[in-house]
């Protein structure tokens, strides 16, 4: 068997660090057998069999000029093997970021904090840490670890499915190369990394007969699970064309009637979503939708979509009723006491 331990990476390649002493090992001989070393394609002897170093070649303070292929020969001139030297650095701890677009799953992405120059892979796993009691700061022993599947394999991303909203997780991302391994541990609470996708299907329509009104409507993002227990709240912004500043409102449901639009001007509208109990952060803004208030006179009939006031546009005190919103009946999450134990921030 070869006296040379095979480092992780392609066969026949050995590794070292610039500025450090590097030992190359002749793979096709018995440990301790004296060999001669040459650079591939060069007749000059680098190290003879009388060096006292046996089957190893020592390069003091290796640099980039030492990279390449080496040949070792036994005393009788037989080929002991070829070795390719590649220089690089041990791994540094990777940088990890986790995000959740819903309350059941989260994903973590990572990136090297320093490029090693060597073949690199990442091992990803997680543990769940559960709170022992509502009034207790102690935590039970971690459960796991479980693999965090890389999706797709080789992508710098892994996904945890079926996460528990009130649990805390410890993510382990280990960068591995032939010179070692380095681990980043990141504590994650789903509450604090929750960031919904932006609302979808934003539409902006004029309200016939009301030159200062626009009706905006939208739907939940498709990625948000269709259960009534975890609702979203919304923030809507609008502005007339060429106007630099946005006006902001927080609608009660999935539509909003803007009552102070500028007559005759197109308006940009966008919406953002957030967990209705303020977990996590607001989503990014939806793509802008545009609409222009109606310029016509008051219609004789009430628009089919809702009971609008039909007197001339003198800003009324009460706006059109909002459409029904998902039930806010008590459910487990609404009844939870959000005490300090449950307010664990991401320990980045």
């Amino acid at each position: 068997s070869s006296p040379c331990p095979q480092a992780w990476g392609p066969p026949g390649v050995q590794y070292g660090q610039p500025g450090r002493s590097v030992k190359l090992c002749c793979p096709g001989v018995t440990a301790g057998d004296p060999v001669s070393w040459f650079r591939d394609g060069e007749p000059k002897l680098l190290q003879g069999p009388d060096s006292g170093l046996g089957h190893e070649l020592v390069l003091a303070q290796a640099d980039s000029t030492d990279e390449g292929t080496y040949i070792c020969q036994t005393l009788d001139g037989a080929l002991g093997g070829t070795v390719t030297l590649q220089l690089g650095y041990p791994p540094a701890r990777p940088v990890v970021s986790c995000q959740a677009a819903d309350y059941e799953n989260f994903s973590c992405t990572w990136s090297p904090s320093q490029i090693s120059g060597l073949p690199t892979r990442y091992l990803t796993s997680y543990r769940k840490k559960t709170v022992l009691g509502a009034d207790s700061q102690r935590r039970s022993p971690s459960t796991g670890p479980w693999p965090c599947p890389q999706d797709p394999l080789g992508a710098a991303r892994c996904v945890v499915h079926g996460a528990e909203f009130w649990s805390q997780y410890r993510i382990n991302v280990t960068e591995v190369n032939p010179l070692g391994a380095s681990t980043r541990l990141l504590d994650v609470s789903l509450q604090s990394i929750l960031r919904p996708d932006p609302p979808q299907g934003l539409r902006v329509e004029s309200v016939p007969g009301y030159p200062r009104r626009l009706r905006a409507s939208w739907t939940y993002p498709a990625s948000w699970p269709c259960q009534p227990h975890f609702l979203l709240k919304f923030r809507l912004q609008y502005r007339p064309a060429q106007h630099p500043a946005w006006s902001t409102v927080e609608p009660a449901g999935l539509e909003e009637v803007i009552t102070d639009a500028v007559a005759g001007l197109p308006h940009a509208v966008r919406v953002s979503a957030r967990d209705f109990l303020d977990a996590g952060t607001w989503s990014t803004w939806s793509p802008e939708a545009w609409g222009t208030p109606s310029t016509g006179t008051i219609p004789k009939e009430i628009p089919a979509w809702g009971q609008l006031h039909t007197q001339p546009e003198v800003e009324p005190q009460v706006d059109s009723p909002a459409p029904p919103r998902p039930s806010l009946q008590p459910h487990p999450r609404l009844l939870d006491h959000r005490d300090s134990v449950e307010q664990v921030a991401v320990l980045a």
Epitope: A92, R93, V95, S113, Q114, I115, L186, A348
Partner: antibody, heavy 118, light 107 residues
């Protein structure tokens, strides 16, 4: 010579914007995470933001989140900090610093002074 | 964020004295602690990384020790050129934080 050189500082009114640059030379810029650290007059050091070598992950101090954006151009060996909605408390000398790794700073620039005042 | 505290905030010592500065983290940071020296009007300089490793080119009179939450920085024999402010800094977290600094001058 291994060095970092910041530029782009100056006097700006509250609410204004500035873009800082940091030119790197003498080392392989694209290998290292890069960071901005600031120091208000007579005060201590405050980490502002960092970016990984590939530029795909960034991190910000809470005090600047949503207002500052760190970026890098590895082809130009340059680090940037776009500062918007500036406040009086952003007045400081801004230093550019390099890794090794993330969170250790073994090479610093001389700094560039940003003054936010009306 | 992890909070870092340093003591003393300032000190005066004689040339040749042994000087010790302590740094405490608000939570366990393993050995992910660096020490920097900053002279007036200059950029900081890394002296010690990962609690106890001397940065290349830094004189051996500087040393560091500790792990977990409690760390110590020592100048074994204070020299006139060591007049500076010294900062500890943790990098266990992905949001690094500095201590408030210790100003060292000569009696």
């Amino acid at each position: 010579e291994v060095q970092l050189l910041e530029s782009g500082g100056g006097l700006v009114q509250p609410g204004g914007s500035l873009r800082l640059s940091c030119a790197a030379s003498g080392f392989t810029f694209s290998v290292y995470s890069m960071t901005w650290v600031r120091q208000a007059p007579g005060k201590g050091l405050e980490w502002v933001s960092s970016i990984v070598p590939y530029g795909d992950l960034t991190q910000y101090a809470d005090s600047v989140k949503g207002r500052f954006t760190i970026s890098r151009d590895n082809s130009k060996n340059t680090l940037y900090l776009q500062m918007n909605s500036l406040r009086a408390e952003d007045t400081a000398v801004y230093y550019c610093a390099k890794g090794p790794g993330w969170g250790s700073f073994d090479l610093w620039g001389r700094g560039t002074l940003v003054t936010v005042s009306s | 964020d992890i909070q870092m505290t340093q003591s003393p905030s300032s000190l005066s010592a004689s040339v040749g004295d042994r000087v010790t500065i302590t740094c405490q983290a608000s939570q366990d940071i393993n050995n992910y602690l660096n020490w920097y020296q900053q002279k007036p009007g200059k950029a900081p300089k890394l002296l010690i990384y990962d609690a106890s490793n001397l940065q290349t080119g830094v004189p051996s009179r500087f040393s560091g020790s500790g792990s977990g939450t409690d760390f110590t920085f020592t100048i074994s024999s204070l020299q006139p050129e060591d007049i500076a402010t010294y900062y500890c800094q943790q990098h266990e977290s992905q949001s690094p934080t500095f201590g408030p600094g210790t100003k060292v001058d000569i009696k």
